[in-house]
Interface confidence: medium
């Protein structure tokens, strides 16, 4: 991998905590102003594999609100607006990092956590499993 | 909002840094063992709006590797396996949290950053935007 020289202006870290515990500035640098996925695009409605967005709230997590996609149908929408079960609507999932308050209810102490979220749905050709 | 009583066992925080700077334990609690999206599913190939996954690496960011989806076509794949430009392949995007080393090259000091990533693609009916 690339070896990057350590910046001499880095905060000190005690060996017993390092590198497991780090300092994190929560002043988020955010290039994206629109955080509500329902406003950012209407793909969830216009897709041939449409989905609903469900609000998942957890005050012990940062961010506390995450939107979860749930495919509306098993199949995909055809020209007539009907569900075609020859194709499958499937969720596109992504692992994301969140901060979990640890110990619980602490405002300034967290642990990194990876969670799997469904972001939207896509229409796929099904895999046929023939049973002998 | 819900008021949760503060845990008396929380680490101390100095007023000048609080609540902007917090302690984060990087020992990730991970319920998901498979982090390579190419292995986790083959939806990117089987979708009617297929996509390629591009590796985005940045040693100053945690996680340093993020996979970005790029739709293969403007249109969607039809029943004959051809690209149909009457429909549009569009990226499904999500805002995610990452940790950015700050100051740069510091192993134990970070700032939270929100970035927009494309997770996969979905097939949508197009909207007509006729320009006057």
């Amino acid at each position: 991998g690339i070896t990057i020289p350590r910046n001499p202006g880095c905060p000190n870290s005690e060996d017993k905590n390092f590198p497991r515990t780090v300092m994190v500035n929560l002043n988020i640098h955010n290039r994206n102003t629109n955080t509500n996925p329902k406003r950012s695009s209407d793909y969830y409605n216009r897709s041939t594999s449409p989905w609903n967005l469900h609000r998942n709230e957890d005050p012990e997590r940062y961010p506390s609100v995450i939107w979860e996609a749930k495919c509306r149908h098993l199949g995909c929408i055809n020209a007539d607006g009907n569900v075609d079960y020859h194709m499958n609507s499937v969720p596109i999932q992504q692992e994301i990092l969140v901060l979990r308050r640890e110990p619980p209810h602490c405002p300034n102490s967290f642990r990194l956590e990876k969670i799997l979220v469904s972001v939207g749905c896509t229409c796929v050709t099904p895999i046929v499993h023939h049973v002998a | 909002g819900i008021t949760i009583p503060r845990n008396p066992g929380c680490p101390n925080s100095e007023d000048k840094n609080f609540p902007r700077t917090v302690m984060v334990n990087l020992n990730i609690h991970n319920r998901n063992t498979n982090t390579n999206p190419k292995r986790s599913s083959d939806y990117y190939n089987r979708s009617t709006s297929p996509w390629n996954l591009h590796r985005n690496e940045d040693p100053e960011r945690y996680p340093s590797v993020i996979w970005e989806a790029k739709c293969r076509h403007l249109g969607c794949i039809n029943a004959d396996g051809n690209v149909d430009y009457h429909m549009n392949s569009v990226p499904i995007q999500q805002e995610i949290l990452v940790l950015r080393r700050e100051p740069p090259h510091c192993p134990n000091s970070f700032r939270l950053e929100k970035i927009l990533v494309s997770v996969g693609c979905t097939c949508v009916t197009p909207i007509v935007h006729h320009v006057a």
Epitope: - | H73, T125, H129, H130, V131
Partner: antibody
């Protein structure tokens, strides 16, 4: 203001090649596709080819073997090449823009046309 | 290829009259996504064609409301409620549901 400006030769000998350039302004070739359509004198319109915003192409299969389309996004130019010209290729050749969000809908804006006469 | 048949090929009218042009396709123009890609263009003498109507009945920007498109499946029509001098020229119907895109032979609207 959307504009498509065409340039190309007036007279070409049989069996020779044709090259026409369509220079666009008021929109980006990375957002919109460009079609080519021709019209023989006193006759109807015939669709030739389209180049999409991502650079992919769709041809009229009847002419595909003789046609080639390409573009230079940075110069806002689309190029049409046609080989092995015959007298029945004599026509007005038009480039036309289609809406970027609605592929295959309609040709909204047209160039002024390039007159091609194939004659010895 | 889809054949587009226009009737009539020539349409003499008096200014202020209503004009009606028919266009029939050899196959349905309903795409598998539910849209019908039938458009109308007007080509005035010595000019390039201009888009009038897209997707059967939608007027393109700047097109007067005296132009009305209708139809479905394989049968379509363009009606001009009160013909004005600037409406004279050749009207083409066109389909972009199937490749290759095809045009009708044109209907010449002229003064009686």
């Amino acid at each position: 203001q959307v504009q498509l400006q065409q340039s190309g030769p007036d007279l070409v000998a049989p069996s020779q090649s044709l090259s026409i350039t369509c220079t666009v302004s008021g929109f980006s070739l990375t957002s919109n596709g460009v079609h080519w359509v021709r019209q023989p004198p006193g006759k109807g319109l015939e669709w030739l080819v389209v180049i999409w915003s991502d650079g992919s192409t769709t041809y009229n299969s009847a002419l595909k073997s003789r046609l080639s389309i390409s573009k230079d996004n940075s110069k806002s130019q689309v190029f049409l090449k046609m080989n092995s010209l015959q007298t029945d290729d004599t026509a007005m050749y038009y480039c036309a823009r289609h809406d970027g969000y609605s592929y295959y809908y309609a040709m909204e804006y047209w160039g002024q046309g390039t007159t091609l006469t194939v004659s010895s | 290829d889809i054949v587009m048949t226009q009737v009539p090929l020539s349409l003499p009218v008096s200014l202020g009259d209503q004009a009606s042009i028919s266009c029939r396709s050899s196959q349905s123009l309903v795409h598998s996504n539910g849209n019908t890609y039938l458009h109308w263009y007007l080509q005035k003498p010595g000019q390039s064609p201009k888009l009038l109507i897209y997707k059967v009945s939608n007027r393109f920007s700047g097109v007067p409301d005296r132009f009305r498109g209708s139809g479905s499946g394989t049968d379509f029509a363009l009606k001009i409620s009160r013909v004005e001098a600037e409406d004279l020229g050749v009207y083409f119907c066109s389909q972009s549901t199937h490749v290759p895109l095809t045009f009708g032979a044109g209907t010449k609207l002229e003064i009686k």
